[in-house]
Interface confidence: medium
């Protein structure tokens, strides 16, 4: 018996659901009463799925797994994958048996998209030409474990003085720390890039240090001059940061984070004592930090409602305040194609083809492309809905007259978090059944 | 080594048609598109359309439709761009280019070395 | 279509310098190709897919950019550089270059 499984790797982000797609070719009067369909992990046998003696089993793994029960009858022994974890990778086998007996093995790559990486200085004021300064480019929850680069204000690479750890939580997901040592000039620019090589996803940032001391004055505060991203569900720091003067204790400052547009109080330290949170019981500050100066705000949870701009307003004897956005961003999943209609295809007929991708932000771009690269905008409509979480699901429809074969493609492409995800559709034979048969 | 040789260097006269011919080697010529992409004197590149060798499917540019047609010999690999009604404007080089990747990205990563067209009375 | 508009059209700069080419799309695109022009000879791919290098190509090259603005940087100019270059998208027809920047070396 022939089971097909796809030659890739099926790759899922983290917390999506993934098919791992197993087919069959059944022969004319087979029946569900004389299949038995068994899933298991490739390495440890471990048994995942079972339909047996013409019933579902259910699920012998965690109860995220389903079969396709209505396309079984038609080859399809399909298994989808619930909120896919870390610990999901690597490979599954499809057992098949009907008289005969075959089996294949498709493989599960877990994925998720870095953040923009947030860049420190240590030490951070007073600095001069001549300076050792240690730079920290961070980046989470990502995985697999990802590449950093590190490029100076002419994108020569700096490579001498690196050293990158990358830590794994407990759901397996990969917070990097790249450090880089370097003596300042007169000014310079230092760029990180942190890369995951599964999703090929580049996530960067960039500091310009211009060492020189600030004029007296008006307190000065700094914040990052790019947009803080953030994923939906992660945490967020919105990194702000005032020089003390020698002397200087906690009793003497004033500190308020608002709302840029509404004025609505978000977070404030007055009176020596932190005063907390006054935006849904979600942010902090880092106390610990305030009197070197560090006056940022740790915004846990993020939704797309949080978006926008956050002022920090800093007085001590003299007053400052600066503005940061927060970008948020959510990976779309990777698109799963459906055909209308599925069965007996021939060249010549009108098939609809859509492509939807779930739960992102913000709204995507769509991109369809025929097997040669051939880009196809002719008959697409594509729709954005949002639900009650601001995060849209995209549907992205093509009507194309079928040739003999072809290969159609579409990728839909998160702008904020520059991921791409994509999938693809073959349809060959003649006639021809979606998915197909064998 | 993968490569597209062109056809030589051709003088016509207005009105009249040019059949340039661009050989492909070292790859399978049914597996990439070709396209086709003139540059005037002393101007950018321009492109006219291109030519799926395996399922022979075309599209040219809306400034070309109803003056080009491509047409692709699988027995012998080689692709052609005929030029009909040429004016003086028509004067150019003409390039073929082999559009390669994966999906979803895609670039032109063999160029023919480029066919000198001079429409001259 | 999409318009794809280079800037600037001709930059004459000295050898060891770091220039910048830009390429802003009318719409968005998915990603943007470059490629390089030298007199008398055919067009030769330079970066693809918006930031990775052709095979062969000098690492003073590299790309940029998503949506609708991408940059083509070289590093430390050298006098073999001097050419046109010319980005390309094809994310939706037609397919469209830039008109080109002219690099000239003083």
């Known amino acids: 018996l022939e089971v097909q499984v796809p030659e890739d790797p099926v790759v899922a982000l983290v917390g999506t659901d993934a098919t791992l797609c197993c087919s069959f070719s059944p022969e004319p009067g087979f029946s569900l009463a004389q299949l038995n369909l068994i899933w298991q992990l490739t390495d440890t046998k471990q048994l995942v799925h079972s339909f047996a003696e013409g019933q579902d089993q259910g699920s012998a793994y965690a109860n995220r797994t389903a079969l396709f029960p209505d396309l079984l009858a038609q080859g399809n022994a399909s298994l989808r994958l619930q909120r896919v974890r870390v610990a999901d990778e690597g490979s599954f086998t499809c057992f098949v048996s009907i008289r005969d007996f075959g089996s294949a093995a498709v493989s599960l790559q877990v994925a998720a998209p870095y953040s923009k990486p947030s860049m420190t200085l240590e030490p951070n004021k007073d600095l001069r030409p001549g300076d050792t300064v240690t730079i920290t480019c961070s980046s989470y929850q990502g995985y697999p474990e990802a590449e950093v680069f590190w490029q100076d204000g002419q994108g020569v690479p700096l490579t001498g003085n690196v050293t990158t750890s990358q830590m794994a939580n407990e759901q397996g997901l990969f917070d990097v720390h790249s450090i880089l040592r370097v003596v300042l000039g007169a000014n310079g620019t230092y760029s990180c890039l942190v890369r995951n090589p599964v999703l090929q996803q580049d996530a960067h940032s960039s500091v310009t240090i211009t060492p020189q001391r600030s004029p007296t004055g008006a307190v000065e505060v700094q914040v990052p001059e790019d947009p803080v991203v953030a994923l939906v569900g992660t945490d967020a720091t919105l990194r702000c940061s005032f020089s003390p003067e020698p002397g200087f204790s906690l009793a003497q400052l004033n500190l308020i984070w608002q709302l840029t547009d509404t004025k609505q109080l978000v977070h404030s330290f007055t009176e020596g004592r932190d005063q907390g949170s006054a935006y849904a019981n979600r942010t902090a500050l880092f106390p610990d930090l305030l009197a070197q100066g560090n006056a940022s705000l740790r915004l846990q949870r993020v939704r797309v409602a949080d978006e926008g701009s956050f002022t920090c307003f800093v007085s001590i004897r003299d007053f400052g305040s600066a503005a940061v956005s927060l970008q948020v961003a959510a990976p779309y999943s990777k698109p799963s194609m459906t055909l209308e209609p599925n069965k007996d295809l021939r060249p010549g007929d009108t098939v609809t083809i859509t492509c939807s991708s779930y739960r992102g932000y913000p709204e995507a771009e769509v991109f369809w492309q025929d097997g040669q690269g051939v880009p196809l905008t002719g008959n697409v409509t594509t729709s954005q809905m949002a639900n009650e979480q601001g995060l849209f699901d995209v549907h992205s429809v093509l009507r194309v007259v079928l040739g003999a074969n072809g290969t159609y493609s579409c990728l839909v492409r998160n702008p904020v978090l520059q991921q791409d995800a994509h999938g693809s559709v073959t349809i060959t034979g003649q006639p021809m059944t979606f998915p197909p048969e064998a | 080594e993968v490569q597209l040789v062109q056809s030589g260097a051709e003088v016509k006269k207005p009105g009249s048609s040019v059949k340039v011919s661009c050989k492909a080697s070292?790859?399978?010529?049914?597996?990439?598109?070709i396209h086709w992409v003139r540059q005037a004197p002393g101007q950018g590149l321009e492109w006219m359309g291109y030519?799926?060798?395996?399922?022979?499917?075309?599209d040219y540019a809306q400034k070309f439709q109803g003056r080009v047609t491509l047409t692709a010999d699988k027995s012998t690999s080689t692709a052609y761009m005929e030029l009909s009604s040429l004016r003086s404007e028509d004067t150019a080089v003409y390039y073929c280019?082999?559009?390669?990747?994966?999906?979803?990205?895609?670039?032109?990563?063999?160029w023919g070395q480029g066919t000198t067209v001079t429409v001259s009375s | 279509e999409i318009v794809l508009t280079q800037s600037p059209d001709f930059q004459s700069v000295t050898p060891k310098e770091k220039v910048t080419i830009t390429c802003r799309a009318s719409?968005?695109?998915?990603?943007m190709n470059w490629y390089q022009q030298k007199p008398d000879q055919s067009p030769k791919l330079l970066i693809k897919?918006?930031?990775n290098l052709a095979s062969g190509v000098p690492s003073r090259f590299s790309g940029s950019g998503s949506g609708t603005d991408f940059t083509l940087t070289i590093n430390s100019l050298e006098a073999e550089d001097a050419a046109t270059y010319y980005c390309?998208?094809?994310?939706?027809?037609?397919?469209?270059f830039g008109q080109g920047t002219k690099l000239e070396i003083k």
């Open positions: 280019a082999r559009y390669s990747g994966s999906t979803p990205y895609w670039y032109f990563d063999v």
């Open positions: 070292g790859y399978s010529f049914t597996s990439y598109t």
């Open positions: 030519i799926n060798p395996n399922s022979r499917n075309t």
């Open positions: 719409s968005s695109v998915s990603y």
């Open positions: 897919a918006t930031s």
């Open positions: 390309q998208q094809w994310s939706s027809n037609p397919l469209t």
